[in-house]
């Protein structure tokens, strides 16, 4: 049976298509191609006569069609108007005609798409953004990419308009992109340039650094404030509620005790209209803001009860500190037998009794800091008494 085949079936605009003919009968007068699904003289593209070995253009010939002696039809520089059905009529020597119909589809060579946006500066957690892939073309598939990945499943991402529009509901600062759209049809594909979203957000709660609270007199106080914000936040400082300056950093040289107080960083985003503050307490003191860990030592750690005494010593290099002692989580001294001396550096127990056995530690502290020693274990033994059974030798 006479058949036709389009090579290719899907043709890019401007390219060529060949309508191949299979099972062409023998003993022919000639053949003709027509545009459409039936033989219509007004829509003849070309005819070919075996007797003259020559083709004759028909009324529907555009100058882009060529017939081959094997009856195949070549159409060059195709347009979308060429899409459709084509009918071959074969005139046989017995004057019985045969017909076969084929078809092909012409698709445009797609241009480089571009992304348009209804809001290029959305506000976080407030605005939605709709991206549209341009241009709108027929028989085209639209795809979207975020950070070079296909769209994740998210209730905040919605596709509409035949996937040509991507809507981000309630944008977040993590939605900056980049975004790309890709258009595809059976003959071509093209991707847009990336588009990034300028999400306006913040300020978040500011952070004041460094984290130090205690400073010595004569030091320089240098505080820096940062709050995540887009556009970047505008900063101002208040000390004890009084405005100081509108800068991100606050610097006070050669501080004194009078510079102690509450330091407030105020961050403002003029676009979102939001403000956030953080308060930090600064203490200027001679006292060491960090007390070193003290060392505890015992004159002996195993003693004989009711007989021996023991001295426990708490050592520290810090000055301006106080010392206190603990035994089994109880504050000492707890009996007449316990004495503190040398500014509480030494704890003496005389005599040691059974109930004094256990864990001891000392703590050094000043008004702004404290530190504990490692614990030390005191063991109390009793010598065995001679046996008293009332019997005399003999």
């Amino acid at each position: 049976q006479l058949t036709t085949e389009s090579m290719p079936f899907n043709v890019a605009e401007g390219k060529e298509v060949l309508l191949l003919v299979h099972n062409l009968p023998q003993q022919l007068f000639g053949y003709s191609w027509y545009k459409g699904e039936r033989v219509d003289g007004n829509r003849q593209i070309v005819g070919y006569a075996i007797g003259t070995q020559q083709a004759t253009p028909g009324p529907a010939n555009s100058g882009r069609e060529t017939i081959y002696p094997n009856a195949s039809l070549l159409i060059q520089n195709v347009t979308q108007n060429d899409t459709g059905f084509y009918t071959l009529q074969v005139i046989k020597s017995d004057l019985v005609n045969e017909e076969a119909t084929g078809q092909f589809h012409v698709y445009p060579e797609l241009p480089k798409p571009s992304i348009s946006s209804n809001n290029s500066n959305p506000v976080e957690d407030k605005d939605a953004v709709a991206f549209t892939c341009e241009p709108e073309t027929q028989d085209t598939t639209y795809l979207w990419w975020i950070n070079n990945q296909s769209l994740p499943v998210s209730p905040r991402l919605q596709l509409s308009n035949g996937n040509r529009t991507l809507t981000l509901l309630s944008v977040t600062r993590n939605d900056t992109g980049p975004y790309e759209c890709e258009i595809q049809n059976p003959v071509s594909a093209n991707r847009s340039d990336p588009v990034t979203l300028n999400v306006t957000y913040g300020p978040d709660t500011p952070t004041i650094s460094p984290s130090d609270t205690y400073y010595r007199p004569g030091a320089n106080l240098s505080l820096s404030c940062y709050a995540a914000s887009n556009p970047p936040a505008q900063y101002s400082w208040l000390i004890n509620g009084t405005f100081q300056q509108s800068t991100q950093e606050l610097f006070i040289p050669n501080i004194t005790v009078n510079n102690s107080g509450s330091y407030t960083c105020h961050a403002n985003n003029s676009v979102t209209g939001c403000n956030r503050t953080t308060v930090k307490t600064i203490i200027v003191t001679e006292l060491s803001p960090v007390v070193a860990k003290p060392q505890i030592k015992a004159s002996k750690t195993t003693v004989t009860g009711d007989k021996d005494s023991v001295n426990l010593t708490c050592s520290t290099n810090d000055t301006g500190i106080s010392i206190r002692w603990f035994f089994k989580n109880q504050s000492l001294p707890s009996s007449e037998r316990m004495k503190l001396s040398q500014g509480n550096t030494t704890l003496s127990i005389n005599p040691v009794k059974r109930e004094d056995a256990g864990t001891y530690w000392c703590e050094v502290f000043n008004p702004i800091s404290k530190n504990q020693s490692d614990p030390i274990m005191l063991n109390v033994n009793y010598n065995a008494l001679p046996q008293e059974n009332g019997l005399s030798p003999g």
Epitope: Y48, I50, G51, T52, Q53, Q54, A55, T56, P57, G58, P59, N61, G63, T66, I67, Y68, P69, N70
Partner: antibody
Framework: QVQLVQSGSELKKPGASVKVSCKAS????????VNWVRQAPGQGLEWMGW????????TYVQGFTGRFVFSLDTSVTTAYLHISSLKAEDTAVYFC???????????WGQGTLVTVSS | DIVMTQSPDSLAVSLGERATINCKSS????????????LAWYQQRPGQPPKLLIY???TRESGVPDRFSGSGSGTDFTLTISSLQAEDVAVYYC?????????FGGGTKVEIK
């Protein structure tokens, strides 16, 4: 690529015969007709006729009947021009040319000079 | 038979200049059913076989430089070389293939001035 290669020059006496060959290559020989064109010295082109390579049917232009015969050997994809009873006025370059799909001659042989002289 | 008449017989043109060759047919070669003009132009360089330049009066054969163009109506035709090059020195022939016998014009020789 399409090529038509003709046989070499011939020098003949009046009354003799000559057979010019035209060997085709680079395409399906039986799909395209072969034309014969004469060009007398210093003159223009004169179409002599053609042969249908599919059916073997020749067509002769008036003035080129009788002594001129077109033939084929499809097994060797070759067309022939046979001229008998040569006359001095047959002296010319004879070209074979392929009939293009639309008619005009899209490929030509290099030509064969036939000189008829006593 | 349709008679094809070319003019001029010869033409001398400076390099880079335009050359225009005319061809007239004794009857129309326009086929009304497809609105095509059955006229071709050939170039024959010295010592060479002819070469097809144009068919349908104005369609350039594949590989022919675009300085060659054809135009015409039912009986009057023109071949134009827009900017003559040295390799364009040749004899140019028109041919009608509308009706048997197909006939050639007498040729126009183009030379460099």
């Amino acid at each position: 690529q399409v090529q038509l290669v003709q046989s070499g020059s011939e020098l003949k006496k009046p009354g003799a015969s000559v057979k010019v060959s035209c060997k085709a290559s680079g395409y399906t020989f039986t799909n395209y007709g072969v034309n014969w064109v004469r060009q007398a010295p210093g003159q223009g082109l004169e179409w002599m006729g053609w042969i249908n390579t599919n059916t073997g049917n020749p067509t002769y232009v008036q003035g080129f009947t009788g002594r001129f015969v077109f033939s084929l050997d499809t097994s060797v994809t070759t067309a022939y021009l046979h001229i008998s009873s040569l006359k001095a006025e047959d002296t010319a370059v004879y070209f074979c040319a392929r009939k293009g799909i639309w008619g005009p001659f899209d490929h030509w042989g290099q030509g064969t000079l036939v000189t008829v002289s006593s | 038979d349709i008679v094809m008449t070319q003019s001029p017989d010869s033409l001398a043109v400076s390099l880079g200049e335009r050359a225009t060759i005319n061809c007239k047919s004794s009857q129309s070669v326009l086929y009304s059913s497809n609105n095509r003009l059955y006229l071709a132009w050939y170039q024959q360089r010295p010592g060479q076989p002819p070469k097809l330049l144009i068919y349908w009066a104005s369609t350039r054969e594949s590989g022919v430089p675009d300085r060659f163009s054809g135009s015409g109506s039912g009986t009057d035709f023109t071949l134009t070389i827009s900017s003559l090059q040295a390799e364009d020195v040749a004899v140019y022939y028109c041919q009608q293939y509308y009706s048997n016998p197909w006939t050639f014009g007498g040729g126009t020789k183009v030379e460099i001035k």
